[in-house]
């Protein structure tokens, strides 16, 4: 397991919510991405491929998410001070093999200015 701080801007604030950006390498074809708050799984997204290269996207812990070819964004809304914590992107790479897990994260600071325009 590889651990580290995200070397990119992980938190993007907008309208009283936050987009948490979890990046993965372009070469990765099949994976599971989990968003952890402290040690708790908040969200997950799993991408797998079928025999004809069809794609399946599944979530056991569903959050509003957005998938691109090198990132998964998880969206948290209605921010309040209780959201302040360490957040981690827990990436399990299935394909290409061998199986590998990487953990990157950062601390989400909540400031009054980010609470002003909450989405309902």
């Amino acid at each position: 397991e590889i651990n580290g701080s995200a070397n990119y801007e992980m938190f993007i604030f907008h309208n009283g919510g936050v987009q948490i950006l979890c990046k993965y390498p372009d070469i990765v074809q099949q994976f599971k991405m989990q968003l952890l708050k402290g040690g708790q799984i908040l969200c997950d997204l799993t991408k797998t491929k079928g025999s004809g290269n069809t794609v399946s996207i599944k979530s056991l812990k569903f959050c509003h998410s957005q998938l691109s070819n090198n990132s998964v964004s998880f969206f948290l809304y209605n921010l309040d001070h209780s959201h302040a914590n360490y957040y981690f992107c827990n990436l399990s790479i299935f394909d290409p093999p061998p199986f590998k897990v990487t953990l990157t994260g950062g601390y989400l600071h909540i400031y009054e200015s980010q609470l002003c325009c909450q989405l309902k």
Epitope: K49, S51, G52, T54, K58
Partner: antibody, heavy 121, light 106 residues
């Protein structure tokens, strides 16, 4: 212990039909893509068909040589996979293997011992 | 469909020899290539997947390499139990096997 056991092979006349069965045990069958691979006597291996898992809506794919004549299906509750073969030709004579593959999270590949199909008048 | 070619079709070798089998795909298969060993009357056995990763329990004398369209399989020192037929298989899109290589004692 992982086991794949094929059955249903035998002698059939050209243009006839046959259904092969394969029963799986010892692994989580519903997570695996199930393939049929055949081998004519003294020849090499030839992929025939695959049926994907429920996550992929049980999608099926066939080699050009059998498309329109063969149908693969599965029953996850029984751990069974089937190959319905219609309009059989002499060149379909082969040992038919049932195989199970998975790539997530690790790559595994299991094979049965095969069942012989002979197409002859 | 992706086509696979394999060479040589027959490979006489002596015990202890280093032997190499080549496989070529009709298009780039992005390392989605496996190698199988088959002994007479038996089902094939997976040796290598994703070009160079050894399947569980496979001895380290077996290895694989390659990229794009071109791949190879090597036995560093041939043992008597290695005699049989070897097949490459692409799994980039569905499955296709190479025609096979029969490895025999010289």
């Amino acid at each position: 212990e992982v086991q794949l056991v094929e059955s249903g092979g035998g002698l059939v006349k050209p243009a006839g039909s046959l259904t092969l069965s394969c029963v799986a045990s010892g692994f989580t069958f519903s997570d695996y893509f199930m393939h049929w691979v055949r081998q004519a006597p003294g020849k090499g291996l030839e992929w025939v068909a695959v049926i994907d898992t429920k996550s992929f809506n049980y999608a099926t794919y066939y080699s050009d040589l059998v498309k329109g004549r063969f149908t693969v299906s599965r029953d996850d509750s029984q751990g069974m996979v089937y190959l319905q073969m219609n309009n059989l030709r002499k060149e379909d004579t082969a040992t038919y293997y049932c195989t199970a593959t998975i790539a997530v999270p690790y790559y595994f590949d299991y094979w049965g011992q095969g069942t012989m199909v002979t197409v002859s008048s | 469909d992706i086509q696979m070619t394999q060479s040589p079709s027959s490979l006489p070798a002596s015990l202890g020899d280093r032997v190499t089998i080549n496989c070529q795909a009709s298009q780039d298969i992005s390392n989605y290539l496996s190698w199988y060993q088959q002994k007479p009357g038996k089902a094939p056995k997976l040796l290598i997947y994703y070009t160079n990763l050894l399947a569980d329990g496979v001895p380290s004398r077996f290895s694989g390499s390659g990229s794009g369209r071109d791949y190879s399989f090597t036995i560093s020192s041939l043992e008597s139990e290695d005699i049989g037929s070897y097949y490459c298989q692409q799994y980039y899109n569905y499955r296709t096997f190479g025609p096979g290589t029969k490895l025999e004692i010289k």
